[in-house]
């Protein structure tokens, strides 16, 4: 469903953002050739496989919002 996809993308975002940008930058710098087309296809297939993988991972590991905050509450500004 769209809700599940949104949640999944949110979960993946922290890890995939940099990887996506790196992959896109690399591909855009390569001329439109058979090699580039193959690479683009690999990235597309790879993301499809990653989506399946992350769907499994998401159900298993704690989501990022549900982890120990990096800033200790005791050092936070009083409300």
């Amino acid at each position: 469903s769209e809700a599940e996809d949104a949640s999944l993308l949110s979960f993946m975002q922290g890890y995939m953002k940099h990887a996506t940008k790196t992959a896109k930058d690399a591909l855009s710098s390569v001329q439109e050739s058979q090699v580039a087309q193959q690479a683009r296809g690999w990235v597309t297939d790879g993301f499809s496989s990653l989506k399946d993988y992350w769907s499994t991972v998401k159900d298993k590991f704690s989501e990022f919002w549900d982890l120990d905050p990096e800033v200790r509450p005791t050092s936070a500004v009083a409300a």
Epitope: G14, Y15, V57, D59, K60, F61, S62, E63, F64, W65, D66, L67, D68, P69, V71, R72, P73, T74, A76, V77, A78, A79
Partner: antibody, heavy 114, light 112 residues
Framework: QLQLVESGGGLVQPGGSLRLSCAAS????????MRWVRQVPRKALEWVSS????????AYRDSVKGRFTISRDNAKNTLYLQMNNLKPEDTAIYYC???????WGQGTQVTVSS | DVVLTQTPGSLSVVPGESASISCKAT???????????LYWLLQKPGQSPQRLIY???TRDSGVPDRFTGAGSGAEFTLKISGVKAEDAGVYYC?????????FGQGTKLEIK
């Protein structure tokens, strides 16, 4: 200083409902994910539910899914746990906790018995 | 769910001596972000639990350096050097790595 004060516990019959509240003060409540953790007297601790900073993300242990609902009101610096269709096995002290277990409330007793 | 097994269930220590508590998980507690969300908590009689150690080995502010957390993967230990009377209570390990968070069954530390 940082404070988490739970309320709303009590004695309820099986199948009944209770709404727990946790009043937070002394820190920027809206920037921390929160949790409810319970403890059966003289026994170990058990995570119940978690909620993200904006309330958009929630998680529950399997045994309470569909019966308990966690929510928060950042304007009021308050965390809630709506508990429906209570069972005897839900009897415990319920603690309001900041994600990562850095700070705990004093707890509120919930007893489910006929 | 990941089960955390603490040993021993209880121990009695003379003030000044050392105490060691083990916490073993049924699987690795390394999260996909590379961090290990393993905690040590202490619950003193009649009080709420308090956190001593987070992410395996980092002491919370105000926690004496006689408390040392160590370990990796699925095996962890809490060592208390030079035990004091105020260290009495029940120690719990806890993990946040997996979506269903779990706690150890507790280790009761008694001071002789």
């Amino acid at each position: 200083q940082l404070q988490l004060v739970e309320s709303g516990g009590g004695l309820v019959q099986p199948g009944g409902s209770l709404r727990l509240s946790c009043a937070a003060s002394g820190f920027t409540f809206g920037t921390y994910s929160m949790r409810w953790v319970r403890q059966v007297p003289r026994k170990a601790l058990e995570w119940v539910s978690s909620i993200s900073t904006d309330g958009g993300g929630t998680a529950y242990r399997d045994s309470v899914k569909g019966r308990f609902t966690i929510s928060r009101d950042n304007a009021k610096n308050t965390l809630y746990l709506q508990m429906n269709n209570l069972k005897p096995e839900d009897t415990a002290i319920y603690y309001c906790v900041i994600a990562g277990y850095s700070d705990w409330g004093q707890g509120t007793q919930v007893t489910v018995s006929s | 769910d990941v089960v955390l097994t603490q040993t021993p269930g209880s121990l009695s220590v003379v003030p000044g001596e050392s105490a060691s508590i083990s916490c073993k998980a049924t699987q690795s507690l390394v999260h996909i972000d590379g961090k290990t969300y393993l905690y040590w908590l202490l619950q003193k009689p009649g009080q709420s639990p308090q956190r001593l150690i987070y992410q395996v080995s980092t002491r919370d502010s105000g926690v004496p350096d006689r408390f040392t957390g160590a370990g990796s993967g699925a095996e962890f230990t809490l060592k208390i050097s030079g035990v004091k009377a105020e260290d009495a209570g029940v120690y719990y390990c806890a993990q946040d790595t997996y979506s269903t968070k779990t706690f150890g069954q507790g280790t009761k530390l008694e001071i002789k």
